[in-house]
Interface confidence: medium
């Protein structure tokens, strides 16, 4: 048993928030400022993430955990751990490489992020349009035309103007 213990890596005793310092006979040293170690037995501490520019600090870095960032107003997080901040658009718009653009006719976006999506085609479910769609809202489908009183007509919205491969005249 003694032999086994002497073969054990002395660094495994170093807790989170410290590192095993090779320059000081492998004693456990606290992580320097602006660095952290989230697990024990580490030979180095990781540099804290800095939330700069469009990023803002959601949680400060500590000796045992990295800083967490979110985005300044007008932007939203994208990617794991908020690796990117993407510009918000208004409802009824989508973000393109040229900035925020209004949704084309036949499409909508009810959020400040994401892209415009085609209105629901009520006729595919055998229903009629109860409320017309807008740039900000999808159509509302109602009962099927057969369920409506005589003379009622079904309105089917056209295909989105910018769906690839389609050419509005």
């Amino acid at each position: 048993f003694e032999r086994t213990r002497s073969l054990q890596d002395p660094c495994s005793n170093c807790p989170a928030g410290t590192f095993c310092d090779n320059n000081r006979n492998q004693i456990c040293s606290p992580c320097p400022p602006n660095s952290f170690s989230s697990a024990g037995g580490q030979r180095t501490c990781d540099i804290c993430r800095q939330c700069k520019g469009v990023f803002r600090t959601r949680k400060e870095c500590s000796s045992t955990s990295n800083a967490e960032c979110d985005c300044t107003p007008g932007f939203h997080c994208l990617g794991a751990g908020c690796s990117m901040c993407e510009q918000d658009c208004k409802q009824g718009q989508e973000l393109t490489k040229k900035g925020c653009k209004d949704c084309c006719f036949g499409t909508f976006n009810d959020q400040k992020r994401g892209i415009c999506r085609p209105w629901t085609n009520c006729s595919l479910d055998g229903k009629s349009v109860l409320v017309n769609g807008t740039k900000e809202r999808d159509v509302v489908c109602g009962p099927s035309p057969a369920d409506l009183s005589p003379g009622a007509s079904s309105v089917t919205p056209p295909a989105p103007a910018r769906e690839p491969g389609h050419s509005p005249q």
Epitope: K97, P164, Q169
Partner: antibody, heavy 118, light 108 residues
Framework: EVQLLESGGGLVQPGGSLRLSCAAS????????MSWVRQAPGKGLEWVSD????????DYADSVKGRFTISRDNSKNTLYLQMNSLRAEDTAVYYC???????????WGQGTLVTVSS | EIVLTQSPGTLSLSPGERATLSCRAS???????LAWYQQKPGQAPRLLIY???SRATGIPDRFSGSGSGTDFTLTISRLEPEDFAVYYC?????????FGQGTKVEIK
């Protein structure tokens, strides 16, 4: 049917100029962003420039910035690329394409070859 | 600039086999902005997939796209003779618009 037809390519000496045209038909030209994309012989695709529907906003690849100018005439349904101070590395087939911004380039012309050589 | 790296450079397969093409971005790209194109010799590129996974009009359902963040995949479930071509991914998330260097799918 959507059609894009490029013209204006040819052989030009280094330092020379050339103006490419792209005639569009089969869709409402004035409603769409348009782009130029090029392809050097045996190489991949390289985006060159784009222009918004009104012609007021343009963007360029760094490799052509200050030398190329994109423009459009919506009354003629035509897209242009004015290329000045041409270099050997500008040798390529130049395609015009309808640009759906988020959704990529859904229609392309057949391309016009520009050769820059002395 | 977002660099798109495609792999493999060349894929040698037989008709009827499954083709899996990879496109890796140097930074995260919202999947809405990722497209795939097919190009045959002497022809212009043709849009296959937009929004990472939506087939363009007229594209057979043997073509499918998937992925998010930095890793995207184009899959051709059963290669037909007309599918042997070069395939490019492209991002329109930010300027400059960039394409991958291409993957050539050739007959084994």
């Amino acid at each position: 049917e959507v059609q894009l037809l490029e013209s204006g390519g040819g052989l030009v000496q280094p330092g020379g100029s050339l103006r490419l045209s792209c005639a569009a038909s089969g869709f409402t030209f004035s409603s769409y962003d348009m782009s130029w994309v090029r392809q050097a012989p045996g190489k991949g695709l390289e985006w060159v420039s784009d222009i918004d529907p009104t012609g007021s906003k343009t963007d360029y690849a760094d490799s052509v910035k200050g030398r190329f100018t994109i423009s459009r005439d919506n009354s003629k349904n035509t897209l242009y690329l004015q290329m000045n101070s041409l270099r050997a590395e500008d040798t390529a087939v130049y395609y015009c394409a309808r640009d759906l911004l988020v959704y990529g380039f859904d229609y392309w012309g057949q391309g016009t070859l520009v050769t820059v050589s002395s | 600039e977002i660099v798109l790296t495609q792999s493999p450079g060349t894929l040698s397969l037989s008709p009827g086999e499954r083709a899996t093409l990879s496109c890796r971005a140097s930074q995260s790209v919202s999947s809405s902005y990722l497209a795939w194109y097919q190009q045959k010799p002497g022809q212009a590129p043709r849009l296959l997939i937009y929004g990472a996974s939506s087939r363009a009009t007229g594209i057979p359902d043997r073509f499918s796209g998937s992925g998010s963040g930095t890793d995207f995949t184009l899959t051709i479930s059963r290669l037909e003779p007309e599918d042997f071509a070069v395939y490019y991914c492209q991002q329109s998330y930010s300027y400059p618009v960039t394409f991958g260097q291409g993957t050539k799918v050739e007959i084994k």
